[in-house]
């Protein structure tokens, strides 16, 4: 299926979005930085197909939502400018779920990426545990919100790879 | 493990209004949509519609728009149902039921209902 | 819109026989969006299959579900006493996100 092109406006104004809710230099948070191991070759379109690497995308995007519409969340962040996000993630999850309906039909669903879901889900459990341990802290949202970028970023360049296989 | 609490049992005349609410603790995600849905006596189920909390996004089903407004607080998460121009055919216990967030994948998780209220029975009477 | 028709309407056993519980759908369902429930008087609904045939947490494994397209089965292989109530299947659509119950088919001791 093809995603609507709003598809990847609302993922770069999402990535813009959690750039401006930055609130402290990442060079004050140097002491609380973490490598989270995200699992770049799981999420990567080069290694996956278009109808796997949807449900792949979609829990990215789930647990991303989940962890920024967490009650701590709404007291470190802009209201603003986190509705907005929040609001982008979810017409994100929208069309990523209206592409699988169409896509899958009655065929089996891509569970081949079983592995890649759990990487996943595994990666973003790191992160809650962390901002757990540190008290949901400034610096700790901080270095989150960071790290969410990065896993954005990613997979806005699993879309664009995937726009140009068609 | 996420459990919802619906509120009591009501009686209400034709045309009025009622409000169901439903009070949801455990591993709770405001991310994840509550829906509610209905089953008159002696009947099957029947989906009415659901919200996001997190954001306040609700879905209709199409027999129920004009007449059903679902409202949610995100603190403590709570789901609010209101059925308004009450016929006595709205007589029928009314369920909140969430998704699972266990399941994977996400997507696959939010189509079914894993947690269900106990029922809050409406009775439309004169 | 979606219909989902379940048959029989009542199926009367004994405890110790098979029972398979049909679910026909009007128009192609993904088996992974085709969910079963079971029903005891009184009782909330109770998820038991999902997917299409992962069973939920607790289910026992005498249940299971199969099917693909616009026809599915919940099969419980051996009926203990506890079995006996209303099974439904549900479907879901999106977008807009739809969730679509059948009838129920009640599970009677015969």
């Known amino acids: 299926c093809d995603l609507p092109q709003t598809h990847n406006l609302r993922n770069k104004r999402a990535l813009t979005l959690l750039v401006q809710m930055r609130r402290l230099s990442p060079l004050s948070c140097l002491k609380d930085r973490k490598d989270f191991g995200f699992p770049q070759e799981k999420v990567d379109a080069q290694q996956i197909k278009k109808a796997q690497a949807i449900p792949v995308l979609s829990e990215l995007t789930q647990q991303i939502l989940n962890i920024f519409t967490s009650k701590d969340s709404s007291a470190a962040w802009n209201t603003t400018l986190l509705d907005s996000f929040c609001n982008d993630l979810h017409q994100q999850l929208n069309d990523l779920q209206g592409c699988l309906m169409q896509q899958v039909g009655v065929q089996e669903f891509p569970l081949t990426q079983e592995d890649a879901l759990l990487a996943v889900r595994k990666y973003f459990h790191r992160i809650t545990v962390y901002l757990r341990e540190k008290k949901h802290s400034p610096c700790a949202w901080e270095v989150v919100r960071a790290e969410v970028w990065r896993a954005l970023s990613s997979s806005a360049n699993v879309l664009g790879r995937l726009r140009e296989e068609k | 493990e996420v459990q919802l609490l619906e509120s009591g049992a009501e009686v209400k005349r034709p045309g009025s209004s009622v409000r169901v609410s439903c009070r949801a603790s455990g591993d709770t995600f405001s991310s994840y949509p509550i829906s509610w849905v209905r089953q008159a006596p002696g009947q099957g189920l029947e989906w009415m519609g659901r919200?996001?909390?997190?954001?306040?996004?609700?879905n209709y089903a199409q027999n129920f728009r004009g007449r059903i407004t679902i409202t949610a607080d995100k603190s403590p998460l709570t789901a609010y149902l209101e059925l308004s121009s009450l016929r006595f055919e709205d007589t029928a216990v009314y369920y909140c039921?969430?998704?699972?967030?266990?399941?994977?994948?996400?997507?696959?998780?939010?189509?079914?209902?894993?947690?269900w209220g106990q029922g809050s029975l409406v009775t439309v009477s004169s | 819109e979606i219909v989902l028709t379940q048959s029989p309407g009542t199926l009367s056993l004994s405890p110790g026989e098979g029972a398979t519980l049909s679910c026909r759908a009007s128009?192609?369902?993904?088996?992974?969006?085709l969910t079963w429930y079971q029903q005891k008087p009184g009782q909330s609904p109770r998820l038991l299959i999902y997917g299409g045939s992962s069973r939920a947490t607790g289910v026992p494994d005498r249940f299971s579900g199969g099917g693909s397209g616009t026809d599915f089965t919940l099969t419980i292989s051996r009926l203990e006493p506890e079995d006996f109530a209303v099974f439904y299947c549900q479907s879901y659509h999106s977008p807009p996100p739809v969730y679509t119950f059948g009838q129920g088919t009640k599970v009677e001791i015969k």
């Open positions: 039921a969430s998704p699972s967030a266990d399941i994977i994948p996400s997507i696959l998780g939010t189509t079914l209902f894993a947690f």
């Open positions: 128009q192609n369902v993904s088996r992974h969006y």
């Open positions: 919200i996001l909390p997190a954001l306040g996004v609700t």
